[in-house]
C-alpha cells in the first residue's frame, strides 16, 4: 500500500488503525494481534475521540458513502456464561487486551441480559453522515459472529497498538517527503506523533530532479523516556528557500545567514535541544505549576515536568495538586486502620494490643496475667477477651460478670439437698438433724438418736472439716451436679443427689419429709424460704412448706 492509504492516528502512547472488512470479532482480533495490537479500547472520552478520528479518516477514503448504518468491532467482549451486570459502566464486559474496568461508557441502548453466548461490542456509525467531533459513536452489543458470518451491518474494525513513547514528526527545512513505517506495518506521511521503533525515510528535493538526498532514521529512546530520531538540524535545507520554507523546519525561531544558510533559535526562557531544531523550556518548573505541597521535577533535558507528592499523598486528576492517600483502602493493618493526613495509624480492637509479627499487627492481651486479672476467682484468657469462672459453690455475679457470689445450696432449684436441716456455708453447705435425730454417715440422712431437747444437730466440727472440691464451675452453672455436702467422703454415695441444672423445676417439699415419721417434733418453726430458678432472688414462701434452713451462725430463717 502507498503512503496515506491507511487510516492511522497516533496520540499519547498509542496508535489506532481502522480497517474495512466483513469479519467476525475473533477474525478482526487476530488481524490486530498479528501486528502486535488488539481490538481498540475506548476507556475514556479522549480515547473515543482518537478512535472517531481514525474512523473519520477511513470513511473519507471510501468514495461513495451509502445511506446505511455500519458497525466496527472494538475490543469489548463478554464471555459465555458471564452475565450482565447493570451496576457497572461496562455491564460485565471486559477489554480483550486486559486492563482494568473503566468508568467511561457510551452504550447505544439498554442491554438485554443473556448469559448463554459470548457477546461482542461494536461502534455504531451512520455511514451516510460525516463524523462530527461532538457526536462520538455509540456502543452496540451483539453476537460476535463467525467466519463467513460476521453479523448484521459489520463493516470493519479498529485496532490499537501501545508504545513506550513517541517521537515528534521530523521537520523539513526544504522540499522533501517523509515516509514513516510503523512497527504495525502501516506507512504514513502525516503522523502527528510517530511511535517508538518506527522508521523514517526522508527523500529531499522537488522529486523530479536528480539532486535528491535521502536519509534514514529510527525513532528510539535516547535517554529514559526521551524519544527522538537522532537527526541534527533541519532536514532537506536549501539555500534557495532559507527560512521561508516551513520556517526552516525550526520549532521556534529561524535565523538566516547572508550565504543562504540558516540556524534555528529559541525564544527567551527556552533552549535549543541536541537536534538543533526543537526548543524546550530552560526550567519548566519556573512557573511553579505544582500546587498543594507538590514538588516540581523537571524532565530530562528541560523537557516538560512532573509534579511529585510527599509520602502519603498522591496527585489528583489534574496531576498538579496533592491529595491525601487513604492508605486504609489497602488494608495495611491487622485490625483497625485510621487514615490521617499524609499517613495512617493502626489500632487494635478491645482485648488486643499492638505487637506480633508484621507491620500493624495486634496480639491478644492476656487479661488473666499475674497482677492484672479482673476476676475475683478463676480467669480464662481467650482470643481478644477472657471469661471469669467461680469455684464450686459460687456463681458469677456483678454487672461485668467478674465477681463470685456464694450459692445458697439450701434453697437450690432442685429441691432439698438434706433429708432434714440444711446449713449454708461459704461455698458449700452442711446437713443437720432435728433434736432426737443424728446425721447418718452419708452426711445427708438423719437417723433416730437419743432424745434431746437441744438445738438441731449438725455434723461435729472436729469430725467434718469444711472442705471444697476445688474444681471451678463453668460461668453459666451455679454448682457442680456431683457435689455432696461439705465433709461428705467422695467415695460415699449420697442417698439423694440434688438436681441443679438451671432449668430444673422448683418443687415444694411437704414438711413431713423433713423428719422421719414418729419424730417428736419438739422444735421451733423455722423460717421457710425458697429461691426462684430464674433470678436466684430469695422470696418469702408464705405458707408454702419447704426445706427448713438454718444459717451457719446459729440464727435461723432468711439470710
Amino acid at each position: 500500500t502507498g503512503a496515506d492509504t491507511e487510516a492511522v492516528v497516533c496520540a499519547g502512547t498509542a496508535c489506532y488503525t481502522a480497517h474495512w472488512g466483513k469479519l467476525s470479532a475473533a477474525e478482526a482480533q487476530n488481524l490486530c494481534l498479528q501486528n502486535g495490537g488488539n481490538l481498540a479500547t475506548v476507556k475514556s472520552e479522549e480515547e473515543a475521540q482518537h478512535v472517531q478520528q481514525v474512523l473519520a479518516q477511513l470513511l473519507r477514503r471510501e468514495a461513495a458513502l451509502t445511506a446505511r448504518m455500519g458497525k466496527f468491532w472494538i475490543g469489548l467482549q463478554r464471555e459465555k456464561g458471564k452475565c450482565l451486570d447493570p451496576s457497572l459502566p461496562l455491564k460485565g464486559f471486559s477489554w480483550v487486551g486486559g486492563g482494568e474496568d473503566t468508568p467511561y461508557s457510551n452504550w447505544h441502548k439498554e442491554l438485554r441480559n443473556s448469559c448463554i453466548s459470548k457477546r461482542c461490542v461494536s461502534l455504531l456509525l451512520d455511514l451516510s453522515q460525516p463524523l462530527l467531533p461532538g457526536r462520538l459513536p455509540k456502543w452496540s452489543e451483539g453476537p460476535c459472529g463467525s467466519p463467513g458470518s460476521p453479523g448484521s451491518n459489520i463493516e470493519g474494525f479498529v485496532c490499537k497498538f501501545s508504545f513506550k513513547g513517541m517521537c515528534r514528526p521530523l521537520a523539513l527545512g526544504g522540499p522533501g517527503q517523509v515516509t514513516y513505517t510503523t512497527p504495525f506495518q502501516t506507512t504514513s506521511s502525516s503522523l502527528e506523533a510517530v511511535p517508538f521503533a518506527s522508521a523514517a525515510n526522508v527523500a529531499c528535493g522537488e522529486g523530479d530532479k536528480d539532486d535528491s538526498q535521502s536519509h534514514y532514521f529510527l525513532c528510539k529512546e535516547k535517554a529514559p523516556d526521551v524519544f527522538d530520531w537522532g537527526s541534527s538540524g533541519p532536514l532537506c535545507v536549501s539555500p534557495k528557500y532559507g527560512c521561508n520554507f516551513n520556517n526552516g523546519g525550526c520549532h521556534q525561531d529561524c535565523f538566516e545567514g547572508g550565504d543562504g544558510s540558516f540556524l534555528c533559535g529559541c525564544r527567551p526562557g527556552f533552549r535549543l535541544l541536541d537536534d538543533l531544531v526543537t526548543c524546550a523550556s530552560r526550567n519548566p518548573c519556573s512557573s511553579s505549576p505544582c500546587r498543594g505541597g507538590a514538588t516540581c521535577i523537571p524532565g530530562p533535558h528541560g523537557k516538560n515536568y512532573t509534579c511529585r507528592c510527599p509520602q502519603g499523598y498522591q496527585l489528583d486528576s489534574s496531576q498538579l495538586d496533592c491529595v491525601d492517600v487513604d492508605e486504609c483502602q489497602d488494608s495495611p493493618c491487622a485490625q483497625e486502620c485510621v487514615n490521617t493526613p499524609g499517613s495512617f495509624r493502626c489500632e487494635c480492637w478491645v482485648g488486643y494490643e499492638p505487637g506480633g509479627p508484621g507491620e500493624g499487627a495486634c496480639q491478644d492481651v492476656d487479661e488473666c496475667a499475674l497482677g492484672r486479672s479482673p476476676c475475683a476467682q478463676g480467669c480464662t484468657n481467650t482470643e481478644g477477651s477472657f471469661h471469669c469462672s467461680c469455684e464450686e459453690g459460687y456463681v458469677l455475679a456483678g454487672e461485668d460478670g467478674t465477681q463470685c457470689q456464694d450459692v445458697d445450696e439450701c434453697v437450690g432449684p432442685g429441691g432439698p439437698l438434706c433429708d432434714s436441716l440444711c446449713f449454708n456455708t461459704q461455698g458449700s453447705f452442711r446437713c443437720g438433724c432435728l433434736p432426737g435425730w443424728v446425721l447418718a454417715p452419708n452426711g445427708v440422712s438423719c437417723a433416730m438418736g437419743p432424745v434431746s431437747l437441744g438445738p438441731p444437730s449438725g455434723p461435729p466440727d472436729e469430725e467434718y472439716k469444711g472442705e471444697r472440691e476445688g474444681s471451678t464451675v463453668p460461668p453459666a452453672a451455679t454448682a457442680s451436679p456431683t457435689r455432696g455436702p461439705e465433709g461428705t467422703p467422695k467415695s460415699t454415695p449420697t442417698t439423694r443427689r440434688p438436681l441443679l441444672s438451671s432449668d430444673a423445676p422448683i418443687t415444694s417439699v411437704p414438711l413431713e419429709v423433713l423428719a422421719p415419721s414418729g419424730s417428736p417434733g419438739l422444735w421451733r418453726e423455722p423460717s421457710i424460704h425458697h429461691t426462684t430458678a430464674a433470678s436466684g432472688a430469695q422470696e418469702p414462701a408464705g405458707g408454702d412448706s419447704s426445706v427448713a434452713t438454718q444459717n451457719d451462725d446459729g440464727t435461723d430463717g432468711q439470710k
Epitope: 529510527l218 537522532g230 521535577i297 530530562p300 511529585r308
Partner: antibody, heavy 118, light 112 residues
Framework: QVQLQQSGPELVKPGASVKISCKAS????????LNWVKQRPGKGLEWFGR????????DYNGKFKGKATLTADKSSSTAYMQLRSLTSEDSAVYFC???????????WGQGTSVTVSS | DIVMTQAAFSNPVTLGTSASISCRFS???????????LYWYLQKPGQSPQLLIY???NLASGVPDRFSSSGSGTDFTLRISRVEAEDVGVYYC?????????FGGGTKLEIK
C-alpha cells in the same frame, strides 16, 4: 549468549590515528545502543560515546568531542571507534559495552589497550 | 554534567561481615516516571567491569543477593551483607539519567 569481542592492543605514535573494533554476537545488534568507555591506567571509568547501529545515530561526550568517530556495520554486527590526533592522554583501555532496555551497561567487551608512545 | 562523589577506599572489612559503599550525585537521579537511574558496577582486578545493580535497587542477573542498594534521589549506598574474598575490587556508581552518562571515581573494597 551475548558476547562482545574486541580487537587486540595497539601501540601508536603521537598524532596518528587508530581504529579499534567490537564484534557483537548473541543479540539483535541493530536494536541496542553500543557504548564506548575509556579507562586510563589506574583511573576510573569515563563514558566516551555511543552508537545506535540501526540507523547510525551517535552521541559523544562533549569532553572528547572531535576525538573519535563511531561507526557500525550491521552486516557484520561490528562497531568501530576511530581515534584521531592521538596524545599520551589517549593512552587507555577502551571498552565496548551494550546498553540494555533498563539503561544499564550489561555486557562488556574485554577491552582494547591503546598505548600512545613515540 | 551530573557529577558523582565516591570515597576512594572503603573502611577495611573482615570476611563474613557487612560492608557499605556510598555515592553522592550532584543532581537527583529520580526521574518523573518514578524510576531512579542509578547503577553499580564492580571491576575485579584485571577484569572488565560487571553490572551489579540497575535502576537503584534491582539485582543484575547472576549477582548474589548479598548485594543490595538503597538511597534517595542524590545519596546512595551499596551494601554487601557477608563479604567474601571474591568481592574485592573497585565499585563504581553511575548514572544513566542524562547524557553524558557519568561514573563515580570508584571505591576500592579492602579486606582486613
Amino acid at each position: 549468549q551475548v558476547q562482545l569481542q574486541q580487537s587486540g592492543p595497539e601501540l601508536v605514535k603521537p598524532g596518528a590515528s587508530v581504529k579499534i573494533s567490537c564484534k557483537a554476537s548473541g543479540y539483535a545488534f541493530s536494536s541496542y545502543w553500543l557504548n564506548w568507555v575509556k579507562q586510563r591506567p589506574g583511573k576510573g571509568l569515563e563514558w566516551f560515546g555511543r552508537i545506535y547501529p540501526g540507523d547510525g545515530d551517535t552521541d559523544y561526550n562533549g569532553k572528547f568531542k572531535g576525538k573519535a568517530t563511531l561507526t557500525a556495520d550491521k552486516s557484520s554486527s561490528t562497531a568501530y571507534m576511530q581515534l584521531r590526533s592521538l596524545t599520551s592522554e589517549d593512552s587507555a583501555v577502551y571498552f565496548c559495552v551494550r546498553g540494555d532496555g533498563y539503561w544499564a551497561m550489561d555486557y562488556w567487551g574485554q577491552g582494547t589497550s591503546v598505548t600512545v608512545s613515540s | 554534567d551530573i557529577v558523582m562523589t565516591q570515597a576512594a577506599f572503603s573502611n577495611p572489612v573482615t570476611l563474613g561481615t557487612s560492608a557499605s559503599i556510598s555515592c553522592r550525585f550532584s543532581k537527583s537521579l529520580l526521574h518523573s516516571n518514578g524510576i531512579t537511574y542509578l547503577y553499580w558496577y564492580l571491576q575485579k582486578p584485571g577484569q572488565s567491569p560487571q553490572l551489579l545493580i540497575y535502576q537503584m535497587s534491582n539485582l543484575a542477573s547472576g549477582v548474589p543477593d548479598r548485594f543490595s542498594s538503597s538511597g534517595s534521589g542524590t545519596d546512595f549506598t551499596l551494601r554487601i551483607s557477608r563479604v567474601e574474598a571474591e568481592d574485592v575490587g573497585v565499585y563504581y556508581c553511575a548514572q544513566n539519567l542524562e547524557l553524558p552518562w557519568t561514573f563515580g571515581g570508584g571505591t576500592k573494597l579492602e579486606i582486613k
